[in-house]
C-alpha cells in the first residue's frame, strides 16, 4: 500500500550519511519501472538537501545529522513516476518526527535575580520567582523538566536556611522566621535548575533579596533631658534642638521622626518640627514668653515615626527645662492711641491732657515723655508726668497738618533702663470748631453791563463747621448800596450782586460785608469791571476808576 | 564506463543555438544522473544543472535557467544540452559527467572529455 | 549558494614533498565535499568523495579530511604525474560549486 508511518529519527545522529530510513514502494511497479522522488522543506526546498531518496530503490536518506531544537518535524511528499514520467501514484505523505536527545543545560532567564521582602515576615511569604529555560522537549521526555534547588545562601544569619525554592515554578518564599533588616539587609542565593527532572544537567544563577525595611524600631532620644535658655518675648527664636537615634532605613518614613509636646504647655507657647536632614527636633516659641508671668516651663515631648509602628513599641520622651530670661521691656503707652477733645485756639500754656506710660518689668523704673512728632509745633509734653500742653495755637481749619477734624502726634515713653528702652504713643487731638471764620464771596472780580446787566450769583464759603455758617447775610457798606443790590438766596448760600443805576465803562470796588449765622462779619471788597454794553458780557476795556 | 561527448568543436554565431550530445556506454544510464558543467578558456569549474534520463527529472542552477536545456534519450544512451540566445560569455568547454544516484549526494566520477563552443561573428 | 574557498591559489613544490590544499564551504555541507584533479586540455578526475573516501583507481598518496566547513587533501611523497589544478566541490546541494583551484606546479 502507498503510504508510510511516521518515522522518528532521534536528533544529534552520528550516521555514517547518508543513512537509510524508510523505503517508497508503489504496488504499480509490476511491469513498469517505478522512479522516487520527494519533495517538501528539507528535500527540495529549505532547507534543502536533508533528505534525498534514491530514485529507483525508494530509499528515502538521511544527508545530515538533525537538531530537533531546530526542526522538530518534517512533512515531506513522496512521489511516484513511470518511465515516460507520468505519475502512478498521488503524493504520499512522509512525517519525519525528530526525537529529544538531551542536548541541551538548563539556562536561566537572568544571571541575576532581584528580589526584595519585608523584614519580619511570617514563613511562606513569597519573595520572588526565577526562571530557567531548557530547549530540550518536556513533554514526551524529562529532557527538558527543570528542577529548582538553592545551593547556598549568604550571609548564613541567623542561619543558613532563611529561604526556599519550589522545584517546578522556582518561586523563592521565606522558609524561617527572624529575617532583621538591621542585622542583615541582603541575602545572596546561588540557585541551581537541573533538568531532566533533577537528574541531569545543572547551570547556576544567584538570587539578591533584598530585605526591605519595616517600622520595627522606634526613634530614641539621645539625649533624654535638656535645659534651654529663651529671652522673654522672642517669637520663632529656636529653643532646642533635640536629638534622636533610629535604626530604620535612613529618610524613610520609618526613620524620618514626628515630635509632639505632651505636656507643660499650657499657653501654646511653643512648637517643634523635624529637621528634614539631620531628623532632629526643633523646639521653637510660637508666642513670646513672659518673665514676669512665669520664668520657667517644664516640656514633655515625645517621637514617634512618620510612619506607623508594626508592633508595639515603647516611645521615648524628653523632658526639656525652658528658662525665661529677663529682658528690660519698652514702657507701653496705655492706651497705645488716646484720642482727646481739645477746642481750637485754646490759649497758649492751657492743659490739653495727661498721657502716661506703663513699665512691664517687676522694677520700679522711672519713665520720662517726650513729643516726638508734632507737626505744627502747637504741644510741649512734660517728661515727669506726661501732662501736654498747648504752645501754639491749634487750628482746626489749617489743612495742612489737620485732616478730618484730627491733628495727630506722636509721644514717646523711656524707661531707665539698662539699655534704656522705649515706647510709642500716638495722640489723637480733635479739634471742636470756634467761629473764627467769617463768609467770603467767591469770586471776588465780576465783569458786568451797564445796560440790562445780568446778575452776578457769588458763593459764599465759610471754614468754620455748622451752627458758624449759613444761613449768610449780606451788606453793601461804604456808600456801594447807591448804585449795588446784594441780596442772599433762599438758602442763605449765595449773594446776587446787580447793578441798579447806569455806571459808565470802568472798574468799581464794591463793599460787601457778609456775616454768617453766628454773626461772625467778614468785610470784602468785590472788584466790579463795567462795560459799555447790554446783558452778558466776558470782558472789556477801560481805565480803572473807584466808586 | 565511458562518456564520448561526440559533436566535434562548435563556432556558432551570437544569437544563435547550439545542442552538444554526450554518449553514455558501460552503466546503465537511465539509473544515474547526467550533470553538465562549463569551463571558460584558463577559468573554474561552472555546474549548469543535470538530468535523471530515468524519469526525465532536471534540476538546474538558477544562473543558467532559460540558457540550457536538458534532455536525454534512454533508447540511445545518449544525454543532451541545447544553450540558446548564445553570447560571447557562452564560449567555454562544456563538460558531461555521470553522478550515481545514492540519493544524488555521490560526486561526478566519470567525466567526458567536453565540447568546445565558440561564439563569434 | 554555497560559496567554496580554496587556498592557496596556487602552489610550488618539488618531487617527493608533502603539499597540502584546503577549502572552506559557507556553511555546513558536513562530509560532502569531492576533490578533483585536472590537466592542461583534459577533463576533471575524481580523486576523493565524502571528503575521505578515494575513487577507484586512485593512489593511496592522496588523503582527504575535514567536515563541515574545514576540508584538506594531502598528497604525500609527489609524483610527476601529479602535478596540474585541484578543484574542491561541495556535492551536499545544488546548486553544486567548485572551489576556484589551486595550480600546483613543479619547482
Known amino acids: 500500500e502507498w503510504v508510510m508511518p511516521p518515522i522518528f529519527v532521534p536528533e544529534n545522529g552520528k550516521g555514517p550519511f547518508p543513512q537509510r530510513l524508510n523505503q517508497l514502494k508503489s504496488n504499480k511497479d509490476r511491469g513498469t519501472k517505478i522512479f522516487y522522488s520527494i519533495t517538501g522543506p528539507g528535500a527540495d526546498s529549505p532547507p534543502e538537501g536533508v533528505f534525498a531518496v534514491e530514485k529507483e530503490t525508494g530509499w528515502l536518506l538521511l544527508n545530515k545529522p538533525l537538531d530537533r531544537e531546530e526542526i522538530a518535524k518534517y512533512e515531506l511528499f513522496g512521489h511516484a513516476v513511470s518511465e515516460n514520467g507520468a505519475s502512478v501514484e498521488d503524493p504520499m505523505n512522509i512525517s519525519i518526527i525528530v526525537t529529544d536527545q538531551n542536548d541541551h543545560k538548563p539556562k536561566f532567564t537572568q544571571d541575576t535575580f532581584r528580589g526584595s521582602v519585608l523584614e519580619g515576615v511570617l514563613p511562606g511569604t513569597s519573595v520572588m520567582q526565577v526562571t530557567a529555560t531548557d530547549e530540550d522537549d518536556a513533554i514526551y521526555t524529562y529532557n527538558g523538566v527543570v528542577a529548582y534547588s538553592i545551593h547556598s545562601q549568604e550571609p548564613k544569619d541567623p542561619h543558613d536556611l532563611m529561604f526556599t525554592i519550589h522545584r517546578s515554578t522556582g518561586t523563592i518564599s521565606v522558609i524561617s522566621s527572624g529575617l532583621d533588616r538591621e542585622k542583615v539587609p541582603e541575602y545572596t542565593l546561588t540557585i541551581q535548575a537541573t533538568d531532566m527532572d533533577g537528574d541531569g544537567s545543572t547551570t547556576t544563577a544567584v538570587a539578591v533579596v533584598e530585605i526591605l525595611d519595616a517600622n520595627d524600631n522606634a526613634p530614641m532620644f539621645d539625649p533624654q533631658k535638656y535645659e534651654a535658655h529663651v529671652p522673654e518675648n522672642a517669637v520663632g527664636h529656636e529653643v532646642q534642638r533635640l536629638t534622636v537615634t533610629d535604626l530604620d532605613a535612613p529618610n524613610s518614613p520609618a526613620w524620618r521622626a514626628t515630635y509632639l509636646i505632651m505636656g507643660g504647655d499650657d499657653g501654646d507657647h511653643f512648637t517643634i518640627t523635624t529637621h528634614p536632614e539631620s531628623n532632629q527636633g526643633i523646639l521653637t516659641t510660637r508666642k513670646g514668653l513672659d518673665f514676669e508671668a512665669k520664668n520657667q516651663h517644664t516640656l514633655y515631648v515625645e517621637v514617634t515615626n512618620e510612619a506607623p509602628f508594626v508592633l508595639k513599641l515603647p516611645t521615648s520622651t524628653a523632658t526639656i527645662v525652658v528658662h525665661v530670661e529677663d529682658v528690660n521691656e519698652a514702657p507701653v503707652f496705655v492706651p497705645p492711641s488716646k484720642v482727646v477733645e481739645v477746642q481750637e485756639g485754646i490759649p497758649t500754656g492751657e492743659p490739653v491732657c495727661v498721657y502716661t506710660a506703663e513699665d512691664p518689668d517687676k522694677e520700679n523704673q522711672k519713665i520720662s515723655y517726650r513729643i516726638l512728632r508734632d507737626p505744627a509745633g502747637w504741644l510741649a509734653m512734660d517728661p515727669d508726668s506726661g501732662q501736654v500742653t498747648a504752645v501754639g495755637t491749634l487750628d482746626r481749619e489749617d489743612e495742612q497738618f489737620v485732616r478730618n477734624n484730627i491733628y495727630e502726634v506722636m509721644v514717646l515713653a523711656m524707661d531707665n533702663g539698662s539699655p534704656p528702652t522705649t515706647g510709642t504713643g500716638t495722640l489723637l487731638l480733635t479739634l471742636i470748631d470756634v467761629n473764627d471764620h467769617g463768609p467770603v464771596p467767591e469770586p471776588r472780580q465780576i465783569t458786568i453791563c451797564n445796560q440790562s446787566p445780568v446778575r452776578q450769583v457769588l458763593n459764599i464759603t465759610d471754614k468754620d463747621l455748622s451752627p458758624h455758617t449759613s444761613p449768610f447775610q449780606a451788606q453793601l457798606t461804604d456808600d456801594s448800596d447807591i448804585y449795588w443790590t446784594a441780596e442772599v438766596n433762599e438758602e442763605g448760600d449765595t449773594v446776587v450782586l446787580s447793578l441798579k443805576k447806569f455806571l459808565k465803562q470802568d472798574t468799581y470796588d464794591v463793599h460787601l460785608s457778609l456775616s454768617d449765622h453766628g454773626n461772625k462779619e467778614q468785610l470784602t471788597v468785590i472788584r466790579a469791571t463795567v462795560c459799555d454794553c447790554h446783558g452778558h458780557v466776558e470782558t472789556c476795556p477801560g481805565p480803572w476808576k473807584g466808586g | 564506463v565511458q562518456l564520448v561527448e561526440e559533436s566535434g568543436p562548435e563556432l556558432v554565431k551570437p544569437g544563435a543555438s547550439v545542442k552538444i550530445s554526450c554518449k553514455a556506454s558501460g552503466y546503465a544510464f537511465s539509473s544515474s544522473w547526467m550533470n553538465w558543467v562549463k569551463q571558460r578558456p584558463g577559468k573554474g569549474l561552472e555546474w549548469i544543472g543535470r538530468?535523471?534520463?530515468?524519469?526525465?527529472?532536471?534540476k538546474y542552477n538558477g544562473k543558467f535557467k532559460g540558457k540550457a536545456t536538458l534532455t536525454a534519450d534512454k533508447s540511445s544512451s545518449t544525454a543532451y544540452m541545447q544553450l540558446s540566445s548564445l553570447t560571447s560569455e557562452d564560449s567555454a568547454v562544456y563538460f558531461c559527467?555521470?553522478?550515481?544516484?545514492?540519493?544524488?549526494?555521490?560526486?561526478?566520477?566519470?567525466w567526458g572529455q567536453g565540447t568546445s563552443v565558440t561564439v563569434s561573428s | 549558494e554555497l560559496v567554496m574557498t580554496q587556498s592557496p591559489a596556487s602552489l610550488s613544490a618539488s618531487v617527493g614533498e608533502t603539499v597540502t590544499i584546503t577549502c572552506r564551504a559557507s556553511?555546513?555541507?558536513?562530509?560532502?565535499l569531492a576533490w578533483y584533479q585536472q590537466k592542461q586540455g583534459k577533463s576533471p578526475q575524481l580523486l576523493v568523495y565524502n571528503a575521505k573516501t578515494l575513487a577507484e583507481g586512485v593512489p593511496s598518496r592522496f588523503s582527504g579530511s575535514g567536515s563541515g566547513t574545514q576540508f584538506s587533501l594531502k598528497i604525500n611523497s609527489l609524483q610527476p604525474e601529479d602535478f596540474g589544478t585541484y578543484y574542491c566541490?561541495?556535492?551536499?546541494?545544488?546548486?553544486?560549486?567548485f572551489g576556484a583551484g589551486t595550480k600546483l606546479e613543479i619547482k
Open positions: 559527467a555521470r553522478q550515481r544516484d545514492y540519493g544524488a549526494l555521490y560526486a561526478m566520477d566519470y
Open positions: 538530468i535523471y534520463p530515468g524519469d526525465g527529472e532536471t
Open positions: 566541490q561541495n556535492h551536499y546541494v545544488t546548486p553544486f560549486t
Open positions: 556553511d555546513d555541507i558536513y562530509s560532502y
